[in-house]
């Protein structure tokens, strides 16, 4: 799996998952959120060369077009196949809320 | 919907439906398919800037941090959101073949 | 149904040539690739290589290029597998398979025993 | 050259869960592919596409992936179970690797 077990250890340049600290404030704007004050949201990116994690027929199709011709612009790409999400604490006035944010990490990578 | 109705009607620069012609002998070297010779697969391509057709949290969060760290490698993928099957005439011997081929046609894509 | 028929065994000594022989059925033949297989007495599974009946393209593993050639006839939905000098190395089960595009062998033949000696 | 890892043999109690893991640099983005290969016979496909199974085999073979290992699970292993295990992949250039294949006993 494109998951950070296997990602993390390798150097690799096809589709796989790849580290992302997000700081609440400093990169999304967010002051509302109190805890935490960031996340491991992660993200997925590199080349989908034919048979590498694809998804879908249509993106196997798509990676064997593109390698037979190369200079086409249709080409699969690597997005976020599982995700999990993130509790997060903030206040309605003094009132502390606990809530989970779905969707907010990615776990694994795959070719679509 | 980044569908065929919206983006073949418009000229759009942002993560859209593109047409794209697959013919089996030329672009995939299949010549066992009979009919059709080719079909219509298209593919999906464009940017993702912020809030446009975002399929997850995660990709609504990693496109705002785009926005705000617009020199970070991290953004969302233009990819296939809706697929159909296709359906071709091949031959065993002299015995004709019906067959679906499941998710062969994007009819439509998002963010993610 | 899905047919892979091998030829039968051959004891051959050194030097000779070999051209065995794997022939599908019940399905479209140019579908498919055909891929082989050799697994010497008491040993594992090693791919050897494979080819695409539909174009004639081969594609061979590093240890087996210039070893053997990989053909096909598509007319007579049969591909081969040939020698040109033959080792006492050579001793082994040779299986051919079918393969799609994507990868991975769904049927197979039911192997060829080639043994070499002098 | 690339390789796939496998243990030389797994043995499990009858009815129990055998469990054969295959480890290889790649596995991460090409998928495994298993064998079953009994005593005198051809080798028989198990489990494709990671964790897809093919008409004919029972639910009790699964396929799963994580990290460079794939792992293929055998519940409720029953005498008939007893065979070689391959698994298959491919290196960074697109050639066909198997392991050295897993003898698995039933006890």
């Known amino acids: 799996a494109l998951d950070a077990a296997y990602c993390f250890r390798n150097v690799q340049d096809n589709c796989c998952l790849r580290p992302l600290y997000i700081d609440f404030k400093r990169d999304l704007g967010w002051k509302w959120i109190h805890e935490p004050k960031g996340y491991n949201a992660n993200f997925c990116a590199g080349a989908c060369p034919y048979l590498w994690s694809s998804d879908t027929q249509h993106s196997r199709v798509l990676s064997l077009y593109n390698t037979i011709n190369p200079e086409a612009s249709a080409s699969p790409c690597c997005v976020s196949q599982d995700l999990e999400p993130l509790t997060i604490l903030y206040y309605i006035g003094k009132t502390p809320k606990i809530e989970q944010l779905s969707n907010m990490i990615v776990k694994s990578c795959k070719c679509s | 919907a980044l569908d065929a109705a919206y983006c073949f009607r418009n000229v759009q620069d942002n993560c859209c439906l593109r047409p794209l012609y697959i013919d089996f002998k030329r672009d995939l070297g299949w010549k066992w398919i009979h009919e059709p010779k080719g079909y219509n697969a298209n593919f999906c391509a464009g940017a993702c800037p912020y809030l446009w057709s975002s399929d997850t949290q995660h990709s609504r969060v990693l496109s705002l941090y785009n926005t705000i760290n617009p020199e970070a490698s991290a953004s969302p993928c233009c990819v296939s959101q809706d697929l159909e099957p296709l359906t071709i005439l091949y031959y065993i011997g002299k015995t004709p073949k019906i067959e679906q081929l499941s998710n062969m046609i994007v009819k439509s894509c998002k963010c993610s | 149904q899905v047919q892979l028929v091998q030829s039968g065994a051959e004891v051959k000594k050194p030097g000779e040539s070999l051209k065995i022989s794997c022939k599908g059925s019940?399905?479209?033949?140019?579908?498919?690739?055909v891929a082989w297989v050799r697994q010497m007495p008491g040993k594992g599974l090693e791919w050897m290589g494979w080819i695409d009946p539909g174009t004639s393209n081969t594609r061979y593993s590093p240890s087996f290029q210039g070893q053997v050639t990989i053909s096909a006839d598509k007319s007579i939905s049969t591909a081969y597998l040939q020698w040109s000098s033959l080792k006492a190395s050579d001793t082994a089960m040779y299986y051919c398979a079918r393969m799609l595009a994507w990868g991975w062998f769904d049927y197979w033949g039911q192997g060829t025993l080639v043994t070499v000696s002098s | 050259s690339y390789e796939l890892t496998q243990p030389l043999s797994v043995s499990v109690a009858l009815g129990q869960t055998a469990r054969i893991t295959c480890s290889g640099d790649?596995?991460?983005?090409?998928?495994a592919h298993w064998y079953q290969q009994k005593p005198g016979q051809a080798p028989v496909l198990v489990i494709y596409d990671k964790s897809d199974r093919p008409s004919g085999i029972p639910e009790r073979f699964s396929g799963s992936n994580s990290g460079n290992t794939a792992t293929l699970t055998i519940s409720r292993a029953q005498a008939g179970d007893e065979a070689d295990y391959y698994c298959?992949?491919?290196?960074?250039?697109?050639?066909?690797?198997f392991g050295g294949g897993t003898k698995l006993t039933v006890l």
């Open positions: 019940g399905y479209s033949f140019t579908r498919y690739y």
């Open positions: 298959a992949s491919y290196d960074s250039s697109l050639m066909m690797v």
């Open positions: 790649n596995l991460g983005g090409y998928y």
